[in-house]
């Protein structure tokens, strides 16, 4: 039977019909009482007092309603949940993930996890309704957990008409013996000891460092990973592991040459709620590698949306060469990551100027052969984009990647809903298309337009009459990603390039074939 539920947009928690709850009002000391009525939350302010007993974890401030027994926790930055038990900054799980309290909510199949409080899970052995739910990390959320001491975090997903448990795609903090770091590397305890320039790190207990804050003599040295060694560390919450070095007989510091553990192609996918011509409205967290490129034009004031882009490393964006035919000076370009609405700033978005961009020197503006470009983001350090739930790199494909014909893949972008529309989409969209066999990706299938071996085709293969809403890329999506699932990660297969109209039956979109450019990409990204 269909149940009316309310979803609190601020906290993403769900509530049954007539259920009530308290919620803190962001950036204020006020508290609201909310009530679920016919699928809509109705909220108003209520008076509160300090709790008579501590109920919040991780330094949360507890307040209880003056006239009834409910309480609410004001959580410090980095924590969330009814009792501030959720660590929003946890980027990976340790060991089996029993103590994992992060916000990963995608199963290995790519399915979205079900909220542990969902009534559909009431009869399951593990749900948010258990008396020990808080201790197990379960509650009014859909984040991956390991309450039963299984081998790694898992969740319930709705598949084949029923709810079943599935392991999550949450990254593990230590991938075997790979010497790499997660997040900003605060927890890195590996043995790399060279800086990005190739200099050797000084031991943290070196006499030369006397007077420096971060040395083996620091009272918290052990907790910070400092000691009688010269391994790279990040004791001060910098962008990545670093160390002290002597350069030209001068004491300085440099970032280290430690690879970051790849979380590329992992995302927290949420099922799109709204269909729109040409695709579905989407959230940026489902496509965290999507970039929006804006340009200042010499003739008109302000910036206007130019093209899509794809985050492939902290400081590099891949896009289409044809987007840059106007030869904009790099300082006229802006790249925005983490944005769901095309022209509305997102809460967690990251904005960058462009240091330089490189258009493939054999780009042909007639045929769009070699339609590929790289943009380097401007930054004061060797890191630019900071990984988060809405900003993450896509995986580049292995050189020998050959996906079967008709593999279902997806594209995303802020482009038009249809070819004749005068406007770009106000919100990010996604579209689901299938890879065409090369025999169906030829000039004769595309009105005698030149199709080269550097291109691939993909389109919506569903049948349908004139009213069918076929998925496709459209003007404004150019430069954005065509990604396919490979080895559990979303992998970049194509760059949106060109097409004949948008969403026409049996007319695929044309994409730059990324596997043909892996060496070009690597070559141009060199330090």
């Amino acid at each position: 039977s269909y149940q009316v539920i309310c979803r609190d947009e601020k906290t993403q928690m769900i509530y049954q019909q007539h259920q009530s709850w308290l919620r803190p009002v962001l950036r204020s000391n006020r508290v609201e009482y909310c009530w679920c009525n016919s699928g809509r939350a109705q909220c108003h302010s209520v008076p509160v007092k300090s709790c008579s007993e501590p109920r919040c974890f991780n330094g949360g401030t507890c307040q209880q309603a003056l006239y009834f027994s409910d309480f609410v926790c004001q959580c410090p930055e980095g924590f969330a949940g009814k009792c501030c038990e959720i660590d929003t900054r946890a980027t990976c799980y340790e060991d089996q993930g029993i103590s994992y309290r992060g916000t990963w909510s995608t199963a290995e199949s790519g399915a979205e996890c079900t909220n542990w409080n969902s009534s559909a899970l009431a009869q399951k052995p593990y749900s948010g309704r258990r008396p020990d739910a808080i201790r197990l990390g379960l509650g009014n959320h859909n984040y991956c957990r390991n309450p039963d001491r299984d081998s790694k975090p898992w969740c319930y997903v709705f598949k084949a008409g029923k709810y079943s448990s599935e392991f999550c795609s949450t990254p593990a903090c230590s991938e075997g013996n790979s010497d790499c770091y997660f997040g900003n590397g605060s927890a890195y305890r590996g043995t790399h000891s060279l800086t990005e320039s190739g200099a050797s790190c000084l031991p943290w207990n070196s006499m030369i460092l006397i007077g420096k804050v971060y040395t083996a003599q620091n009272p918290s040295a052990q907790a910070l990973g400092l000691g009688k060694h010269n391994y790279c560390r990040n004791p001060d919450g910098d962008a990545k592991p670093w160390c002290h070095v002597l350069k030209n007989r001068r004491l300085t510091w440099e970032y280290c040459d430690v690879p970051s553990c790849s979380t590329c192609g992992l995302r927290q996918y949420s099922q799109p709620q709204f269909r729109i011509k040409g695709g579905l409205f989407a959230d940026i967290a489902s496509h965290p590698w999507q970039a929006a490129i804006f340009a200042k034009h010499r003739r008109s004031p302000g910036e206007r949306f130019l093209c899509g882009g794809i985050l492939i490393s902290s400081c590099w964006i891949l896009s289409a060469a044809h987007c840059f035919q106007e030869r904009f000076p790099p300082h006229h370009l802006t790249v925005i990551l983490g944005r769901t609405y095309r022209v509305v700033p997102g809460e967690e978005e990251q904005k960058f100027e462009v240091e330089k961009y490189i258009v493939h020197k054999e780009f042909d503006d007639d045929t769009y052969d070699n339609d590929i470009a790289l943009l380097q983001l401007k930054s004061d350090s060797s890191r630019c984009a900071q990984e988060s739930s809405v900003v993450r790199t896509v995986c580049l494909p292995p050189a020998d990647l050959q996906l079967p014909d008709w593999t279902e893949c997806e594209l995303s972008g802020y482009g038009k809903h249809e070819a004749l529309s005068p406007f770009y989409s106000e919100r990010l969209k996604e579209a689901h298309v299938r890879l065409y066999p090369s025999s169906r990706c030829t000039s004769q299938h595309l009105l005698n337009r030149t199709v080269t071996d550097n291109m691939l085709c993909a389109g919506d293969t569903r049948s349908g009459g004139p009213q069918a809403n076929l998925h496709d890329a459209c003007q404004g999506d150019s430069g954005g990603p065509l990604v396919c699932l490979n080895d559990g990660r979303m992998t970049l297969v194509g760059i949106i390039s060109w097409g004949l109209g948008c969403g026409q039956k049996d007319v695929p979109g044309v994409y730059t074939k990324v596997t043909n450019y892996l060496d070009w990409i690597r070559d141009n990204m060199r330090p």
Epitope: V258, P259, I358, A399, R526, P527
Partner: antibody, heavy 114, light 112 residues
Framework: QVQLVQSGAEVKKPGASVKVSCKAS??????INWVRQATGQGLEWMGR????????GYAQKFQGRVTMTRDTSISTAYMELSSLRSEDTAVYYC?????????WGQGTLVTVSS | DVVMTQSPLSLPVTPGEPASISCRSS???????????LDWYLQKPGQSPQLLIY???NRASGVPDRFSGSGSGTDFTLKISRVEAEDVGVYYC?????????FGGGTKVEIK
């Protein structure tokens, strides 16, 4: 610190193929380049492979005769040269490239002789 | 292909004296990403080559500061301010900007 250890010397007949391995330890995410040096001669760049994605770039001179591959599970890169001739007798080096070829293997002597 | 021409072919030196090796490329070796990938390598007798200077003028880790690199466009120079006995070997310039990457023919530095 990156360390590169190459396979041992090989003696091959003209027309045969040789496959040289290069095992990396340390940061293994950088290009592996192959450079050869005939006795008493200079250095000659043959090509490169990205150990992560496996993409390659070869010098035109060796195109069609050289194949560079890698096995990420054992952090090893391979260079196979086919249709060997006497002028392929040389020491073959692998070198790891980040900002330059900062780390080199010890070299593998390949002798082509009938 | 970019041809790298080194001079002199042979350089007899006196310990404590300066030395200079020139390298000229047949075309500009500025990469499309704006960097100039001009490196200098030293191959000591019976050893693998070792990196001295990268990207024209950056000294590699552990390389003594008596070695310096300079130049731009097509003309590049490696200087040793005071030659020491351990500096003997063959010095190669190398361009990594255009495929195929190419080495110079080498300059043999030996003690007089």
């Amino acid at each position: 610190q990156v360390q590169l250890v190459q396979s041992g010397a090989e003696v091959k007949k003209p027309g045969a193929s040789v496959k040289v391995s290069c095992k990396a330890s340390g940061n293994t995410s950088y290009w592996i380049n192959w450079v050869r040096q005939a006795t008493g001669q200079g250095l000659e760049w043959m090509g490169r492979i990205d150990p992560g994605g496996g993409s390659t770039g070869y010098a035109q001179k060796f195109q069609g005769r050289v194949t560079m591959t890698r096995d990420t599970s054992i952090s090893t890169a391979y260079m196979e040269l086919s249709s060997l001739r006497s002028e392929d007798t040389a020491v073959y080096y692998c070198a790891s490239y980040y900002y330059a070829m900062a780390y080199w293997g010890q070299g593998t002597l390949v002798t082509v002789s009938s | 292909d970019v041809v790298m021409t080194q001079s002199p072919l042979s350089l007899p030196v006196t310990p404590g004296e300066p030395a200079s090796i020139s390298c000229r490329s047949s075309q500009s070796i500025v990469h499309s990403n704006g960097n100039t990938y001009l490196d200098w390598y030293l191959q000591k007798p019976g050893q693998s080559p070792q990196l001295l200077i990268y990207k024209v003028s950056n000294r590699a880790s552990g390389v003594p500061d008596r070695f310096s690199g300079s130049g731009s466009g097509t003309d590049f120079t490696l200087k040793i301010s005071r030659v020491e006995a351990e500096d003997v070997g063959v010095y190669y310039c190398f361009q990594g900007s255009h495929v195929p990457w190419t080495f110079g023919g080498g300059t043999k530095v030996e003690i007089k």
